[in-house]
């Protein structure tokens, strides 16, 4: 019998100061590059070691970014999302969704998304 996999979803506001090498993370997703099945949202695929996000410590690989400086990231092309981040200024406010897997039985499967490939 298969166990049920639940997710504890929390939201958090993260304020980052852009570092010498930018914000210090990579993103995937968008309407033209779906990362999770039936979801065109923008997700964190990699945190750069010693970058701004890593030094802050709250943003995690796999997090969904809901907004940047109050601007919603829904229904954006991937490159439009990239441009929004790159042009977001020195102080950047991110609304993020953390999704923590709560396992009840065998390990489940989260769409086709896998930040590490």
């Amino acid at each position: 019998m298969n166990g049920r996999v639940d997710y504890l979803v929390t939201e958090e506001e993260i304020n980052l100061t852009r570092g010498p090498s930018g914000l210090g993370f990579n993103i995937v997703g968008g309407t033209d590059q779906q990362y999770v099945s039936n979801d065109s949202g923008i997700y964190v695929s990699r945190i750069k070691e010693n970058g701004a996000a890593a030094l802050d410590g709250r943003l995690q690989e796999g997090d969904k970014i809901l907004s940047v400086n109050g601007q919603d990231l829904k229904n954006l092309l991937h490159q439009d999302a990239v441009d929004l981040f790159r042009n977001a200024g020195y102080a950047v406010s991110l609304r993020v969704q953390h999704r923590l897997q709560v396992q009840n039985g065998p390990i489940g499967h989260r769409g086709e998304g896998d930040p590490s490939g």
């Epitope: 914000l23 210090g24 993103i27 995937v28 033209d32 990699r46 790159r86 086709e112 590490s116």
Partner: nanobody, 126 residues
């Protein structure tokens, strides 16, 4: 298990062309930024070129601009580097590299990449 396998290196004369290829497996290739780096004997690994997930955006080191062209085929999980007008100073081991997603930090530092091939030797004689 992630694998990046380069091919196409060899010994050529100055002014000749070579086409390097990198075959990726074990990753969802279409999500990845891909790049080529090179390392000459006794020197650091240097950035050559990078290409975004869709192939619409490329970036080149100044030393190869106008001579080298990076491209990708997401259907075949391959990235290629077409090298024209090769010079002796292009002699190096060429490495394919990949990282998931689009960087908001930079894409020219080897530390920006998670996965690497074993390299292919390119030697240009004068």
């Amino acid at each position: 298990h992630v694998q990046l396998v380069e091919s196409g290196g060899g010994l050529v004369q100055a002014g000749d062309s070579l086409r390097l290829s990198c075959a990726a497996s074990g990753i969802t290739f279409r999500w990845y930024t891909m790049a080529w780096f090179r390392q000459a004997p006794g020197k650091e690994r240097d950035f050559v070129a990078t290409i975004n997930w869709s192939g619409s955006d490329t970036n080149y080191a100044d030393s190869v601009k106008g001579r080298f062209t990076i491209s990708r085929d997401n259907a075949k999980n391959t990235v290629t580097l077409q090298m024209n007008s090769l010079q002796p100073e292009d002699t190096a081991v060429y490495y394919c590299a990949g990282v998931p997603g689009t960087s908001l930090s930079g894409e020219t530092d080897p530390r920006d990449y998670d996965y690497w091939g074993q390299g292919t030797q390119v030697t240009v004689s004068s």
